[in-house]
Interface confidence: medium
């Protein structure tokens, strides 16, 4: 025969999940940090396509003799975006160029705007967070999470998709950014660096943390992901920085202990349900918020980012396991899977607490605080 040829939050509990202030003096950026963190969204930072088929990829099957059958891809039909809330828009990240780049990459061709024009947008993510410039918004209330404590059954799918490790979440995980701003969790995934090299996506005053968790949510105003892509507030991501601490994090260990099973790109395993909120900081009241984009193609904008002020602590061994176990495309380790920080282009990052009014040693000179834009929200 012949044939022709898919992450972003929850609490740790107990108040011991991490440092309440991620901005200590020792956190100043190091010279060895990945040069990409300084880059604008240049072409070298722009990933390529994922494995949804390109229109040119889609074939009609032309029967041949039984001896030499053929599955042809030239005219293959695509699948329209499914009606399930958890499902992505097939057409949103299709490689129109027909260059057979079925996987986008970090730090290589093809340029991300060629994969998805939205990647060249003005309001992209991740960004550098400067607490001194954040606008304190008392209207930003503590986040509310409901149904995040999952029973062991049904099991969840944990997958190495070639650019992250992703845990697909079942229906029923509800999150509210505030009154009338309700969301359902879809999946979570991580971003990390390599040995001695941090790999968070967001940075704080230029400092990159060892890793970052993203829990991706869909607004209850939309039935499907494809409807929400690019719509203001259609998607919301909870993000938390992961740092090194003295003890093993038992919540994360439930996932990290299974990474060897999915070392190969494209492999997956089933893990018992767990308390997803235990993967997040315990303090849901102190966070930064801004409107940005998905940090990988299709880079759709309108995404509400909520970045916790408190960090989550993992042991050194756990951080090493995260950054040194998985493999990506082409026999390369899956490492440094973060996008360079993007310009704010006039955006104001809001804070749910007075982040700019502290005695941080980094405030070299008085700074004019931005005013809260969401006071009436």
């Amino acid at each position: 025969q012949r044939l022709p040829r898919m992450q972003e939050d929850s609490p740790l509990g107990g108040g011991s999940s991490g440092e309440d202030d991620p901005l200590g003096e020792e956190d100043l950026p190091s010279e060895e940090d990945s040069p990409r963190e300084e880059d604008p969204p240049g072409e070298e930072d722009l990933p390529g396509e994922e494995d949804l088929p390109g229109e040119e990829d889609l074939p009609e099957v032309k029967p041949k003799s039984e001896e030499e059958g053929s599955l042809k891809l030239e005219d293959l039909p695509t699948v329209e975006a499914p009606g399930d809330p958890q499902e992505p828009q097939n057409n949103a990240h299709r490689d129109k160029e027909g260059d057979d780049q079925s996987h986008w990459r970090y730090g290589g061709d093809p340029p991300w705007p060629r994969v998805s024009p939205a990647c060249a947008g003005r309001f992209q993510s991740p960004v550098d967070i400067r607490p001194q410039l954040a606008a304190f918004c008392p209207a930003l209330r503590p986040l509310e999470l409901l149904g995040f404590q999952l029973p062991p059954l049904p099991e969840l799918r944990l997958r190495n998709n070639g650019h992250s490790v992703q845990l697909t979440l079942p229906p029923g995980l509800e999150m509210a950014l505030g009154p009338g701003r309700e969301y359902r969790a879809l999946q979570l995934h991580l971003h990390w660096g390599a040995a001695g090299r941090p790999g968070s996506e967001h940075t704080v005053e230029g400092h990159r943390f060892p890793a970052e968790i993203h829990v991706v949510h869909l607004s209850t105003a939309f039935a499907r992901v494809d409807e929400a892509l690019g719509r203001p507030g259609g998607l919301a991501v909870l993000a938390a920085f992961l740092e090194e601490g003295p003890e093993e994090n038992s919540a994360y260990e439930q996932l990290l202990s299974r990474l060897e099973e999915i070392a190969e790109e494209g492999s997956e395993t089933q893990v018992p349900g767990l308390d997803i909120s235990a993967l997040l900081p315990s303090d849901f009241s102190r966070y930064f918020q801004y409107e940005g984009s998905l940090t990988t193609p299709p880079c759709a904008q309108g995404v509400i980012w909520t970045v916790f002020n408190q960090t989550v602590m993992l042991s050194a061994k756990q951080l090493h396991t995260l950054s040194d176990t998985l493999w990506g495309p082409g026999d390369s380790r899956l490492q440094l899977n973060f996008r360079a920080t993007q310009p704010l282009n006039g955006r104001v990052i809001e804070a749910s607490f007075p982040a700019g009014v502290d005695s941080s040693p980094r405030a070299a000179e008085p700074v004019q605080l931005n005013s809260c834009l969401a006071a009436g929200d």
Partner: antibody, heavy 118, light 107 residues
Framework: SGPGLVKPSETLSLTCTVS????????WSWIRQPPGKGLEWIGY???????NYNPSLKSRVTISVDTSKNQFSLKLTSVTAADTAVYYC??????????????????WGQGTTVTVSS | ETQLTQSPGTLSLSPGERATLSCRAS???????LAWYQQKPGQAPRLLIS???SRATGIPDRFSGSGSGTDFTLTISRLEPEDFAVYYC????????FGGGTEVEIK
């Protein structure tokens, strides 16, 4: 492609060649259909070599991939008459973007008939 | 392993009539990873629906899928002569399984 007749206790070997596109970054499945019966999934392989097999056949099945030839192959050991079927290869579509989703088998080969008989 | 049971086994209808095919799972389908296929004699199956309700490109809108959890339905609103075939549902959870099929025959 492969032999249409296999003797009991021997190994059935089939190869599926992908044309008109790259085998890379997709999952590729084998499915079979005994005469007059329904479809049975045998297993799939990712272009990287990761596999997932039907638990009932796992002990006898090996699926491999040769990206340089744009081919993937099926080996089924210790065959019996119950393995007589039309064997199909198909593209199994999973998205691998920031969202995971399963789309189904969207491209199929025309099938090859394998008879197990002495 | 999730078992899929399709009913009825055979559906005898006339062109222009409405066909309703059922697929029931032994346990809840993981995030509605359920697909429907059409197979005509001597041909390979053809993907109709994925995600329980989304038509594959090129599939006429008389085909629609619905359902969630354990109960799923494929509806053909108005049967055309070319729609008489066998229809299979398929799920993807820990493993991948097909239903036993429903034959839609001309009355």
């Amino acid at each position: 492609s492969g032999p249409g007749l296999v003797k009991p206790s021997e190994t059935l070997s089939l190869t599926c060649t992908v044309s008109g596109g790259s085998i890379s970054s997709y999952y590729w499945s084998w499915i079979r259909q005994p005469p007059g019966k329904g479809l049975e999934w045998i297993g799939y392989i990712y272009y990287s070599g990761s596999t997932n097999y039907n638990p009932s056949l796992k002990s006898r099945v090996t699926i491999s991939v040769d990206t340089s030839k744009n081919q993937f192959s099926l080996k089924l050991t210790s065959v019996t008459a119950a393995d007589t079927a039309v064997y199909y290869c198909a593209r199994d579509q999973h998205s691998s973007s920031v969202y995971y989703y399963y789309y189904g088998m969207d491209v199929w080969g025309q099938g090859t008939t394998v008879t197990v008989s002495s | 392993e999730t078992q899929l049971t399709q009913s009825p086994g055979t559906l005898s209808l006339s062109p222009g009539e409405r066909a309703t095919l059922s697929c029931r799972a032994s346990q809840s389908i993981y995030i509605n990873y359920l697909a429907w296929y059409q197979q005509k004699p001597g041909q390979a199956p053809r993907l109709l629906i994925s995600g329980a309700s989304s038509r594959a490109t090129g599939i006429p809108d008389r085909f629609s899928g619905s359902g969630s959890g354990t109960d799923f339905t494929l509806t053909i609103s108005r049967l055309e002569p070319e729609d008489f075939a066998v229809y299979y549902c398929q799920q993807y959870g820990r493993s991948l399984t097909f239903g036993g099929g429903t034959e839609v025959e001309i009355k």
